[in-house]
């Protein structure tokens, strides 16, 4: 029998400086574009190579962005969230939620949700 797959959720404040080509990531989500079932939150879907986020190194694909410069991202339309990032200024503070997969159960068995198997 496979072990249970659990998740360790942590939050982090990430301060990015907008680079020549911007912040350097893509997002999905919003009230009109639910990426995760029953969750209209905003998630990172791509980190652009050599962009500001990639060079900083802390933001990861799959992270949930909770706020931008202190402004909550709950209940936003997708395009409104995009516009909020684009208008966020030179120094951008992101409150993010990392979700790290943790394997519990018998050693040597992978859970169904483990992408490494």
């Amino acid at each position: 029998m496979n072990g249970r797959v659990d998740y360790l959720v942590t939050e982090e404040e990430i301060n990015l400086t907008r680079g020549p080509s911007g912040l350097g990531f893509n997002i999905v989500g919003g009230t009109d574009q639910q990426y995760v079932s029953n969750d209209s939150g905003i998630y990172v879907s791509r980190i652009k190579e050599n962009g500001a986020a990639a060079l900083d190194g802390r933001l990861q694909e799959g992270d949930k962005i909770l706020s931008v410069n202190g402004q909550d991202l709950k209940n936003l339309l997708h395009q409104d969230a995009v516009d909020l990032f684009r208008n966020a200024g030179y120094a951008v503070s992101l409150r993010v939620q990392h979700r790290l997969q943790v394997q519990n159960g018998p050693i040597g068995h992978r859970g169904e949700g483990d992408p490494s198997g």
Partner: nanobody, 125 residues
Framework: QVQLVESGGGSVQAGGSLRLSCTAS????????MAWFRQAPGKEREFVAA??????YYADSVTGRFTISRDNAKNTMYLQMNSLKPEDTAVYYC?????????????????????WGQGTQVTVS
């Protein structure tokens, strides 16, 4: 990993029409930003059209003749090509990226996209 498969290419007389399709894998197709590029023999890859959450974008050379659209239920993007000209002859490629950039979107920049199809040949005589 997203996989893209183009279809619908072929040979047509000038003034005719074709509809290209690009079918994508993945359960979150509605979140993809997608585009069509083309490459004629001996020429650079050229932007044709793109469709994002916020709307459609076209190269000047195809505006008014080509229409990009998508059917999220079928995981498919389309390029309706009317009033075709010999200079539209090329291999047409579908491209995609998951989500919307938080930066200024440059639909014609190939670096905006992570995934590419194998292409479908369009010949206009």
């Amino acid at each position: 990993q997203v996989q893209l498969v183009e279809s619908g290419g072929g040979s047509v007389q000038a003034g005719g029409s074709l509809r290209l399709s690009c079918t994508a894998s993945g359960r979150t197709f509605s979140t993809y930003t997608m585009a069509w590029f083309r490459q004629a023999p001996g020429k650079e890859r050229e932007f044709v059209a793109a469709i994002s959450w916020s709307g459609a974008y076209y190269a000047d050379s195809v505006t008014g003749r080509f229409t990009i659209s998508r059917d999220n239920a079928k995981n498919t993007m389309y390029l309706q090509m009317n009033s075709l000209k010999p200079e539209d002859t090329a291999v047409y490629y579908c491209a995609a990226v998951i989500g919307s950039t938080v930066d200024s979107y440059r639909p014609g920049d190939p670096l905006e996209y992570d995934y590419w199809g194998q292409g479908t040949q369009v010949t206009v005589s």
